[in-house]
Interface confidence: low
């Protein structure tokens, strides 16, 4: 029972974690303008792995994708790769773990097979979580060391002059989402690995006792592993203008809410 609970909880925690990693990867707010260190510009810039956005005052967000691969910093490419690898491994891990769940019967699949699949998915979750944490940490380090190119139109083809004022960027919401999500995936993976040890057939457990000193036998008792981990558990490019005297054309061309931050 405890094994099933541990495995199930590990799966759920990993699922939440991987959803978080996907969300973080897609979010635009990896870096946001540090308002306190740079009060000069009236416009709020924020940047993600895939595009940068400008918030203007009359109610629009303008986001432009990074349309070049070659012009982007190698570290940004590395962060993208780490996050994608994390997502892919996590997704495969989830797929494997679904079939490995003790509560799901698939034909005459033996417990040893389920144990192996649980271990495999657990390792995948651990690596996935580590990839996400590494990716987010590398990006955070880029911000701390001012490696990140800070002008909003540097890679976005927005036109206009590049600001001479070096805008300071600080940690965006996506970094915190990524760290938490990576941590959850990692914890879920560890729980799956723990569950795996209790999933092995009973005779295997007792055989293991005979090969170890009696002091270690307690670790191999069937069902001897309990899981008691408690975890509490877009930027959208939307038109925000809500009315006013302007025509649609005027609104579109006017400085919008999202130019300022």
């Amino acid at each position: 029972m405890a094994v099933t609970a541990c495995q199930g909880l590990g799966f759920v925690v990993s699922l939440i974690g991987i959803a978080g990693i996907i969300a973080a990867t897609c979010m635009d707010q990896w870096s946001t303008q540090d308002l306190y260190n740079n009060p000069v510009t009236a416009v709020f810039n924020y940047q993600g792995l895939w595009r940068s956005c400008v918030r203007e005052s009359s109610g629009f967000t303008e986001c432009r994708g990074y349309f070049t691969l070659l012009g982007l910093p190698a570290m940004l490419q590395a962060v993208r790769a780490l996050m994608i690898v994390g997502i892919v491994l996590g997704a495969i891990g989830l797929l494997v773990s679904i079939f490995a769940l003790k509560c799901i019967r698939i034909g005459s699949m033996e417990d040893s097979a389920k144990a192996n699949m649980t271990l495999t998915s657990g390792i995948m979750f651990i690596v996935s979580g580590l990839c996400a944490i590494a990716g987010v940490s590398v990006f955070a380090n880029m911000l701390v060391t001012n490696f990140w190119m800070s002008t909003a139109n540097m890679y976005t083809g927005m036109g206009g002059m590049v600001q001479t004022v070096q805008t300071r960027y600080t940690f965006g919401a996506a970094l915190f989402v990524g760290w938490v999500a990576g941590g959850l995936t990692l914890i879920g993976g560890v729980m799956m690995c723990i569950a795996c040890r209790g999933l092995a057939p009973e005779e295997t457990n007792y055989k293991a006792v005979s090969y170890h000193a009696s002091g270690h036998s307690v670790a191999y008792k069937p069902g001897g592993f309990k899981a008691s981990t408690g975890f509490g558990s877009n930027t959208k490019n939307k038109k925000i203008y809500d009315g006013g005297a302007r025509t649609e054309d005027e609104v579109q061309s006017y400085p919008s809410k999202h130019d300022y931050v």
Epitope: T41, V54, S58, N153, M158, D242, G243, G244, D259, Y260
Partner: antibody
Framework: QVQLQQSGPEVVRPGASVKMSCKGS????????MHWVKQRPGQGLEWIGM????????RLNQIFKDKATLTVDKSSKTAYMQLSSLTSEDSAVYYC????????WGQGTTLTVSS | DVLLTQTPLSLPVSLGDQASISCRSS???????????LEWYLQKPGQSPKLLIY???SRFSGVPDRFSGSGSGTDFTLKITKVEAEDLGVYYC?????????FGSGTKLEIK
Amino acid sequence: QVQLQQSGPEVVRPGASVKMSCKGSGYTLNNFWMHWVKQRPGQGLEWIGMIDTSNGETRLNQIFKDKATLTVDKSSKTAYMQLSSLTSEDSAVYYCAPYGNFADWGQGTTLTVSS
Amino acid sequence: DVLLTQTPLSLPVSLGDQASISCRSSQSIVYGNGNTYLEWYLQKPGQSPKLLIYKVSSRFSGVPDRFSGSGSGTDFTLKITKVEAEDLGVYYCFQGSHVPFTFGSGTKLEIK
């Protein structure tokens, strides 16, 4: 028709605080910046700051950072500005204006600081 | 802070004449995205200011076409062709590119 209704004139003592309001109608007070502007009698316009009505985030002119506090109540579609430690220099008409282009200004709140 | 210098401070005109008001900024108010957030307002006696021109040259809805804005970088101009009585008041330029946003000192358009 988009309209902004500002609170009535205020007469206060030096050193006191005052909180003026700016109530919107004809649109949703959400997801834009509400600006506040000061105009002393017979003088020009001075930008105080702005508040993002979607999340309460503010940008203040440094001159007013210890003077003005901007807040918003989305449920009542009302933006507020509190002015503290008032002196005669704060006697002025205060305007609220949304959307960044200041197209739809309130009628202004006259503040008189007098002993 | 960006200083906006308006000239002249007072502009006496005859009805039907052309009026021109200059606004010069202490630094470029072209934002990084290429937009220049310079606006012109008219404040009539006892009234709130009203928007005339935004982004240098775009006329706001309902503003007569005798009002036009031009300029770039740091030098901007508001022109009123054939001044009418209803155009009298104080004109302000405003920049919304750099916090703190700033207004010009104002130009009073009056009858000669």
